[in-house]
């Protein structure tokens, strides 16, 4: 004869564990039903009654089978710098990711807490390291013999064209100007682009650079405290 199927709640055999989607309630000392995703335990089980589950309220969720007394709060609404790639439902948290042309400056377990715009290197500077989804563009001054005349998050410094006779010497932000119509060697027309994992920023959202100059130095900092805790107010 097949073994009799036990219905929750039931006392487990000594040394055995509760079945899938069940949990052991320490107080009742019984195997009891878990609540399904999108629900939480409204009333815990006893020796004679099983777990009573209830649906998560608006702006809260549970993603797994559980026996939590309250559903988890969905994260804050996505900021204007972000795109909601997963909505807050009873079974899943909201996920915010950065919009094109921005990178994740502060990540969280899923998605991004703070997006910032990819830096645009100004004329005289080229991209030394392209931006990624999680790191900003690094700019460097154009070395002698190279230039960049654009404000761009993708353009690198390009070599000056080589002239038979130079009319105007090139500098870090301008190509050389030749007197003859055909220089001996010139780069292909147009800016040189680095591979760009993040799309370039749309015109209406790009920050306004204020050019000036300062010496370039850098050193690493130790990690400091975390930013303020994320709000859990939903829609």
């Amino acid at each position: 004869l097949p073994a009799q199927v036990a219905f929750t709640p039931y006392a487990p055999e000594p040394g055995s564990t509760c079945r899938l989607r069940e949990y052991y309630d320490q107080t009742a000392q019984m195997c009891c039903s878990k609540c399904s995703p999108g629900q939480h335990a409204k009333v815990f089980c006893t020796k004679t009654s099983d777990t009573v589950c209830d649906s998560c309220e608006d702006s809260t969720y549970t993603q797994l089978w559980n026996w939590v007394p309250e559903c988890l709060s969905c994260g804050s609404r996505c900021s204007s710098d972000q795109v909601e790639t997963q909505a807050c439902t009873r079974e899943q948290n909201r996920i915010c990711t950065c919009r094109p042309g921005w990178y994740c400056a502060l990540s969280k377990q899923e998605g991004c807490r703070l997006c910032a715009p990819l830096r645009k290197c100004r004329p005289g500077f080229g991209v030394a390291r392209p931006g990624t989804e999680t790191s900003d563009v690094v700019c460097k001054p154009c070395a002698p013999g190279t230039f960049s005349n654009t404000t761009s998050s993708t353009d690198i410094c390009r070599p000056h064209q080589i002239c038979n006779v130079v009319a105007i010497p090139g500098n870090a932000s301008m190509d050389a100007v030749c007197t003859s119509t055909s220089p001996t060697r010139s780069m292909a027309p147009g800016a040189v682009h680095l591979p760009q994992p993040v799309s370039t920023r749309s015109q209406h959202t790009q920050p306004t650079p204020e050019p000036s100059t300062a010496p370039s130095t850098s050193f690493l900092l130790p990690m400091g405290p975390s930013p303020p805790a994320e709000g859990s107010t939903g829609d």
């Epitope: 990540s107 703070l114 900003d136």
Partner: nanobody, 124 residues
């Protein structure tokens, strides 16, 4: 101890001004990018402005362009956010960060040092 401390927040009427300060201790702010962000009530963190250490370039979010000015005083190891013509939608917790250029290779997805924030409320 490496830390940033923001101050200067408060309650102000629409059209008013505030000057936020972000004082660094335990490290030199002069070699780092400085960023201000804010968290409006019930919303996520929003980027406001960045001042790049190497070129002193300043960038601003469209929502604050022409009203906010980021600056720094290297001698005082402090970064400022001058906020003019404030609007109710500027209400929120303002935090500043210091990051080394281009982010850390070890922790590329995180800003380096964060302050705890200063509350700004714009209301009539």
């Amino acid at each position: 101890d490496v830390q940033l401390v923001e101050s200067g927040g408060g309650l102000v009427h629409p059209g008013g001004s505030l000057r936020l300060s972000c004082a660094a201790s335990g490290f030199t702010f002069s070699a780092d990018d400085a960023t201000w962000a804010r968290q409006p009530p019930g919303k996520g963190l929003e980027w406001i402005s960045t001042l790049y250490f190497d070129t002193e370039e300043k960038t601003y979010a469209d929502s604050v362009k022409g009203r906010f000015i980021i600056s720094r005083d290297i001698a005082k190891n402090t970064v400022y956010l001058q906020m003019n013509n404030l609007k109710p939608e500027d209400t929120g917790m303002y935090v500043c960060t210091a990051t080394w250029a281009g982010g850390s290779l070890l922790r590329p997805a995180s800003f380096g040092v964060w302050g705890q924030g200063t509350q700004v409320t714009v209301s009539s």
